[in-house]
């Protein structure tokens, strides 16, 4: 009889009827920026502090009647989902509410900014344990709201935001589009995207993961023991805020980057039917539903990686797309993808002291995406080995020549548009282990990294017959760091990583009589961290 | 991410006859004006003036005061609703959109964003 949403996100072995800590206390504090709330509700009483913060616009309409229970409805429900005694995720967590939404559920960017500043001030005046900020609201894209979220995140605060209920690209809304925010889309009891009237959950590359957001039972402000079902990406975000609070309660030293990576790693994969999303957004939208990860004591030390997509470059001939990792993360590889196949490849370059992944559009191309593989690895040190495009002569292999450095990724780009050049084999582990091999007209970039106990290997999978994509997965215990397409007789559209799977996309030429040398191959670089071992390249 | 802005970013030039009135602000505006792409969500008349990241607290207050002074000379009353400095340097101001060109020429200004609505999700 546990509500379906709690069953979904908290594995049975981690569930207790009781508060998350024996005395119901928690060192984590959650700040909720929403409507006013009914703090006396049995579900949340004694756990909620209503701050004196209030920054809301006037309600619309002269005949608007402020009914307390309606004014408190949204916020009370969310407070219950985060920390409610029975229907809450993080049952022992204390919550502070800031009123930034009026009785109609409307607020302003400026009011939200002042609310975020209030939290920062509180943090400075009275430093406490870990802070989680829940933003169950969305407006149009706002550079300043995103900046404020970024600055607050840099102080160690974890921000969780609703992706938005507009059945649209979450990148067009704020704070959902802020890279430092954990952005949450909504799924239903069948793990499918939530439909809300004619609209529904937002999607796209700015969504980090999905969580339950349909028919969620929680505290109703109608009375102190009333409950009701509500739906939306706010409810989904509240689940993730609760999970984050539980994670921080167990491991208070977890950073934002670690939290995000662990949420991604332990989420339930490939249960969402992607057909609900617009076709061009399917590849960008994460197919994962949040679950509470085990504690770091049980799973510490492993290499954690995630895929970060850039915005679309646009179609101009010189257009580029840039994907960035979070400051704590290391960029271990860079690839690119174009639906038309017209691209000039990808490379890692330094911008403002940070390594970024850049993809280059080609003449006649409809635009490209850069795809960064962003990883967390203690004491990692990476460098890029470049070989400029050879004017003539054989393919030039690029390997990691520094001692104890291993290959984690390969990038290739062409200074001139030569689609034929892209159809040549680029990387062959069975011939040259641990080397990037580029066509003579391509510049080759090898990403070489050193970290204690880091070992890597190339794993390939080829299909000789007609195919639109070829995949290869790293086995259990190994993490995908690099992904390339080794094209046969087909035009490669590019390659990208989906969790631990390397996906090579091609425009198939339709020839079924290819030899194995002409086969399209997905080549994955799989790494693992064994802190006791030395860095090494594993020969297959 | 910033490159996503499905966003209106406008460079507002000051009318030439105004230039003579702008003593200290006679340099060309390099700051940009931004507003929500969804017209129904815009709140014209309220603006967040965002200053360069390194701007000191005192400079934020001076900039806001300077804008009030310049506006008053032109017969406009503006109201500084809030001054930001804990997360970013800037201030929230209620003023006529006529003054945007002037505000964009203020020293330290990086961009000005028109206020807009957010909604419970």
């Amino acid at each position: 009889s546990i509500p379906w949403n709690l069953e979904r996100i908290i594995p049975a072995w981690q569930q207790t009827e009781e508060d998350s800590s024996p005395d119901g206390s928690s060192q984590v504090e959650v700040y909720l920026l929403d409507t006013s709330i009914q703090s006396g509700h049995r579900e949340i009483e004694g756990r909620v502090t209503i701050t004196d913060f209030n920054s809301v616009p006037e309600e619309d309409g002269t005949r608007f009647h402020r009914q307390a229970s309606k004014c408190d409805s949204h916020g009370t429900h969310l407070a219950g989902v985060v920390s409610g005694r029975d229907a809450g995720v993080a049952k022992g967590t204390s919550l502070h509410s800031l009123r930034v939404l009026n009785c109609q559920g409307k607020g302003t960017v400026s009011g939200t900014l002042i609310g975020l500043e209030f939290i920062r001030k509180s943090q400075l005046i009275q430093p406490s344990g870990p802070l989680v900020v829940l933003l169950p609201l969305a407006g149009g894209y706002s550079r300043i709201l995103n900046t404020a979220c970024q600055r607050l995140a840099r102080t160690g605060v974890v921000l969780v935001a609703a992706a938005g209920n507009f059945r649209d690209d979450a990148c067009l809304y704020s704070p959902a589009s802020a890279p430092e925010v954990i952005t949450v889309g909504a799924t239903n009891a069948q793990d499918q995207p939530v439909t809300l009237g004619t609209l529904g959950t937002n999607f796209g590359r700015c969504v980090d993961l999905f969580a339950p957001g349909k028919d969620i039972i929680g505290a109703s402000s109608d009375c102190s023991t009333c409950y009701m079902s509500q739906s939306g990406t706010s409810q989904a975000a509240a689940h993730v805020a609760g999970i984050v609070a539980m994670m921080l309660n167990r491991d208070p030293a977890l950073t934002l980057a670690e939290l995000r990576q662990r949420l991604i790693l332990f989420s339930t994969k490939d249960v969402i039917n992607m057909a609900w999303f617009p076709e061009d957004q399917r590849v960008l939208t994460p197919n994962r539903v949040a679950t509470l990860p085990p504690s770091t004591q049980e799973t510490g030390g492993q290499l954690l990686c995630r895929t970060v997509w850039s915005a679309h470059s646009g179609p101009t001939r010189t257009a580029t797309a840039t994907a960035r990792c979070a400051p704590e993360e290391e960029l271990l590889s860079c690839s690119s993808f174009s639906r038309s196949g017209r691209r000039r490849g990808d490379r890692i370059e330094a911008i403002g002291g940070q390594q970024v992944c850049k993809a280059l559009n080609a003449f006649g191309g409809e635009g490209v995406y850069a795809v960064a593989r962003c990883c967390l690895l203690p004491r990692v040190n990476c460098s890029i080995h470049n070989t400029p495009a050879a004017r003539a002569g054989p393919q030039t292999p690029v390997h990691c020549h520094q001692k104890d450095h291993v290959l984690t990724g390969c990038s290739f780009h062409w200074e001139v548009e030569n689609l034929r050049a892209q159809q040549q084999p680029l990387l062959r582990s069975r011939h040259q282990p641990g080397q990037c091999v580029g066509h003579q007209e391509a510049s080759v970039h090898a990403s070489c990294c050193h970290a204690p106990g880091l070992e890597c290997k190339i794993k390939e999978h080829g299909i000789a017959g007609p195919a639109e994509q070829v995949t290869v997965a790293c086995e259990a215990g190994w993490t995908l760091t690099g992904c390339n397409v080794l094209p046969g007789a087909s035009l490669p559209l590019g390659a990208y990583s989906v969790d631990n799977v390397c996906v090579a996309r091609i425009r198939d030429a339709g020839r079924a009589d290819r030899t194995s040398e002409e086969a399209t191959v997905a080549a994955a670089i799989c790494c693992r961290s064994r802190p006791s071992a030395k860095a090494s390249w594993v020969h297959q | 991410q910033d490159e996503d802005g499905d966003y209106e970013e406008l460079m507002l030039a000051l009318p030439s006859q105004e230039d003579s009135l702008v003593d200290e602000a006679s340099h060309v505006a390099t700051a940009t004006f931004r507003r929500c792409s969804k017209e129904a969500w815009r709140l014209p008349g309220t603006y967040v003036v965002v200053l360069m990241e390194e701007t000191q607290r005192l400079q934020v207050e001076q900039t806001a005061h300077r804008l009030q002074t310049w506006a008053a000379r032109r017969g406009y009353v503006i109201k500084v609703l809030h001054v930001f400095y804990d997360l970013f340097p800037g201030f929230l101001v209620k003023m006529s959109s006529d003054l945007l060109g002037l505000a964009l020429k203020l020293p330290h200004v990086e961009y000005i964003e028109e206020d807009s609505l957010v909604f419970a999700q």
């Epitope: 119901g24 049995r42 004694g46 229907a87 009375c223 023991t225 | -």
Partner: antibody, heavy 118, light 107 residues
Amino acid sequence: QVQLQQPGAELVKPGASVKLSCKASGYTFTSYWMHWVKQRPGQGLEWIGEINPSNGRTNYNEKFKSKATLTVDKSSSTAYMQLSSLTSEDSAVYYCARERPLYAMDYWGQGTSVTVSS
Amino acid sequence: DIVMTQSHKFMSTSVGDRVSITCKASQDVSTAVAWYQQKPGQSPKLLIYSASYRYTGVPDRFTGSGSGTDFTFTISSVQAEDLAVYYCQQRYSTPRTFGGGTKLEIK
């Protein structure tokens, strides 16, 4: 597992008082409100009142305000109800029940049968 | 005080039948209604909470519905062990109030 233990029966004289106990185990006593319910023989259920064990806050049915007093002892995880000035009308089974906010009164004691007789 | 009225004190039914018990609140109580079963000589047992949610371990032949003032408790296929008195209770406000109870008799 959750248990609420109540003594089986109490025999009291008219005009006297009685203090009924309800010992909770298997959960954090201070996390959930405790309710008391009266049931006269062959009759329905009548709500007396509730107490929050964490802070001692109480709510009473107006009808029982001068009859019942609810208290708790956190150290022994026990809830008490004192009934005063007993008459034959007070002869009934008295149940304690834990209320979880969402699930209502999910665990009940076995009830204490109070007989008021001279 | 909110009055909860169960219009039938007794209901007679046969094994395998579908039976519905109604409960009417004197004012809007949202969905803050619970249903309890009390078998002879036992303490009450929670079956349904928040008007329509089945409590842990309760067989799925028991269902609840309604909101506002009108609530229904249904047993889709009565079993011999369902012989009991069924009470509705409002949790909307204090004092909490119970319906008078409906005794289910098996023919």
